[in-house]
């Protein structure tokens, strides 16, 4: 059996344009090596957001550069995507792959809509 | 090319428009008159590589990033590896392919 | 995959299918002509590739999918394959020629 990933379907994020939600996959293996990669989805373009891998038992870590940032739990990942702007509202996909050992397992999810609201600029006092 | 049985052959795959990184690369072959059959992939940075069973501890799969080329090294050739190999990108939500190299007959024989 | 080889008229409709051993909607489906790499047609099981006629559509789930072409176009005739990629080794279906009646 192919490889279930789950995540939730709607996500609202802060007014400091941070949303965090869980990607959460039923390993059909033992995988050692996962690899985890945020997707956003708009129209029919699919582009990477950001992407991690990591040893089971070991820290999630995304490049210094990337706008995410996670941590790991077991079959579960806490993913947390900031800097997001009202533009970046979207469909944002979790893709799981277990790298190592073989065989190569790929599990996706139906993706979270991430909505972003711009805040109101604040009104000049006198 | 033409190789002989238990002789050794490299394939090389150059492509342009995308970082060879970003993706999981692959090999696939189809032997005359046949269907297609996946042989191996490296993945995104190189570390993992996974192969069919007919051509595993035979060939190697490799890849320079820098150049964004992709390497097939076929050792102890047979003649049932007589086939054109595609190289082939596997795409972001999966390995579908949705670009092909143009093929390269590679005939084992004595 | 079956038919191994379907006769058709242009303008029919052509049911294709595909079993797979792997339980999962991790499946594609390409189109070969003689001398030519293939071309993906569905991924998903289910989504168009872009540029693909709106002709072609897939359908199915689990371990049972079929391609349709709903009016065969000369341009149709040959070789479909079905391809898993949800587990390696991703295999291919052993192919379905459609061909003119």
């Known amino acids: 059996k192919a490889m279930h990933v789950a995540q939730p379907a709607v996500v609202l994020a802060s007014s400091r344009g941070i949303a965090s939600f869980v990607c959460e996959y039923a390993s059909p293996g033992k995988a050692t090596e996962v690899r985890v990669t945020v997707l956003r989805q708009a129209d029919s373009q699919v582009t990477e957001v950001c992407a991690a891998t990591y040893m089971m038992g070991n820290e999630l870590t995304f490049l210094d550069d990337s706008i995410c940032t996670g941590t790991s739990s077991g079959n579960q990942v806490n993913l947390t995507i900031q800097g997001l702007r009202a533009m970046d509202t979207g469909l944002y996909i979790c893709k799981v792959e277990l790298m190592y050992p073989p065989p190569y397992y790929l599990g996706i999810g139906n993706g979270t809509q991430i909505y972003v609201i711009d805040p109101e600029p604040c009104p000049d006092s006198d | 090319g033409v190789v002989q049985p238990g002789r050794s052959l490299r394939l090389s795959c150059t492509a342009s428009g995308f970082t060879f990184s970003n993706y999981g690369m692959h090999w696939v072959r189809q032997a005359p008159g046949k269907g297609l059959e996946w042989v191996a992939v490296i993945w995104y940075d190189g570390s993992n590589k996974h192969y069919g069973d007919s051509v595993k501890g035979r060939f190697t799969i490799s890849s320079d990033n820098s150049k964004n080329t992709l390497y097939l090294q076929m050792n102890s050739l047979r003649a049932e590896d007589t086939a054109v190999y595609y190289c082939a990108r596997g795409e972001r939500l999966g390995s579908y392919f949705d670009y092909w190299g143009q093929g390269t007959l590679v005939t084992v024989s004595s | 995959q079956s038919p191994g080889t379907l006769s058709l008229s242009p303008g029919e409709r052509a049911t294709l299918s595909c079993r797979t051993s792997v339980s999962s909607s991790y499946l594609a489906w390409y189109q070969q002509k003689p001398g030519q790499a293939p071309r993906l047609l569905i991924y998903?099981?289910?989504s168009r590739a872009t540029g693909i006629p709106d002709r072609f559509s897939g359908s199915g789930s689990g371990t049972d999918f079929t391609l349709t072409i709903s009016r065969l176009e000369p341009e149709d005739f040959a070789v479909y394959y079905c391809?898993?990629?949800?587990?390696?080794?991703?295999?291919f279906g052993g192919g379905t020629k459609v061909e003119i009646k």
């Open positions: 998903g099981a289910s």
């Open positions: 391809q898993q990629y949800g587990i390696s080794p991703f295999t």
